[in-house]
Amino acid sequence: LCQGSKYSTCASCPSCPDHWMKYGNHCYYFSVEKKDWISSLEFCLARDSHLLMITDKQEMSLLQDFLSEAFHWVGLRNNSGWRWEDGSPLNFSRIYSNSLVQTCGAINKNSLQASSCEVSLQWVCKKVSP
């Protein structure tokens, strides 16, 4: 992962906005502050991005290497099955879900985990790089 502010002049790392990280064709924002799930979603949307939707195991593994034990909201919700915000199903990983009242998804270095959506967590935004 490249940080835009550090590598903005590097040809191999086309710039992402300040405080965003580059991986492949995408920019990622890892928040420091905490919000509930819907506020995290709104934060990302306001910056022309979306709450993290992970496409495959490789991307998930790379992001987990970057994360700590702290959970971060991702764009995953249980609406009659776990689905990403674009409507696609979660199919490359399992989510640890203990209760029906936990309907939003979060990720840390170890797992995808269901949580009640009101919990304040850090979050990850993702958008296509310029």
Partner: antibody, heavy 125, light 112 residues
Framework: QVTLKESGPGLVKPTQTLTLTCTFS??????????VGWIRQPPGKALEWLAH???????WYELALKSRLTISKDSSKNQVVLTMTNMDPVDTATYYC?????????????????WGPGTTVTVSS | DILMTQSPLSLPVTPGEPASISCKSS???????????LEWYLQKPGQSPRLLIY???NRFSGVPDRFSGSGSGTDFTLKISRVEAEDVGVYYC?????????FGAGTKLELK
Amino acid sequence: QVTLKESGPGLVKPTQTLTLTCTFSGFSLSTFGMGVGWIRQPPGKALEWLAHIWWDDDKWYELALKSRLTISKDSSKNQVVLTMTNMDPVDTATYYCARVIYYGSRSAYYSMDYWGPGTTVTVSS
Amino acid sequence: DILMTQSPLSLPVTPGEPASISCKSSQSIVHSNGHTYLEWYLQKPGQSPRLLIYKVSNRFSGVPDRFSGSGSGTDFTLKISRVEAEDVGVYYCFQGSHVPVTFGAGTKLELK
């Protein structure tokens, strides 16, 4: 499948200390967002929350009983223990443990989504 | 402490007929985050309570759709569209928005 079961002495003498154990399965109390609480119900009366403990060992008590209560957990044994000192006949009740789900506040707003069958405690000399 | 007042305390119902239980809180139980943490529990005879409804109107897993919850602020209602024999028991409302969390005194539903 989530299950919880309470165990205790059944009969306690006044001024003695009550020790109750909640043994659970189907979830881990090390998992983010999980907790276990204790609720009691005196005969023919309503439910009363006593205490709960979260996955990270954060503990909360009913204020009026705080000086008498201690809650602890052993995540490896899947157990939560509640002790209540200086028992009195008015503490005669059925004591339940329940799993509680974190909604963002340590002290309140949670769901008790699974309950144990309860254990009856009688305080009498 | 927030007082949760349920009515009626006893509710005789003919099977197949609807039933409605009221729960009023002594002050608003809308949390500062905008959510209302009002739940309904059913305690069948000789059993422990079980969660029916959470956050005012959400049915918990396995709860039949004849059960519905509604309300806001301080006034809440549990409705059963068609009462069945297995619905007999004591229904408790519970508020988790403010410390200490509190239960109502219960409404005993029985068959006529």
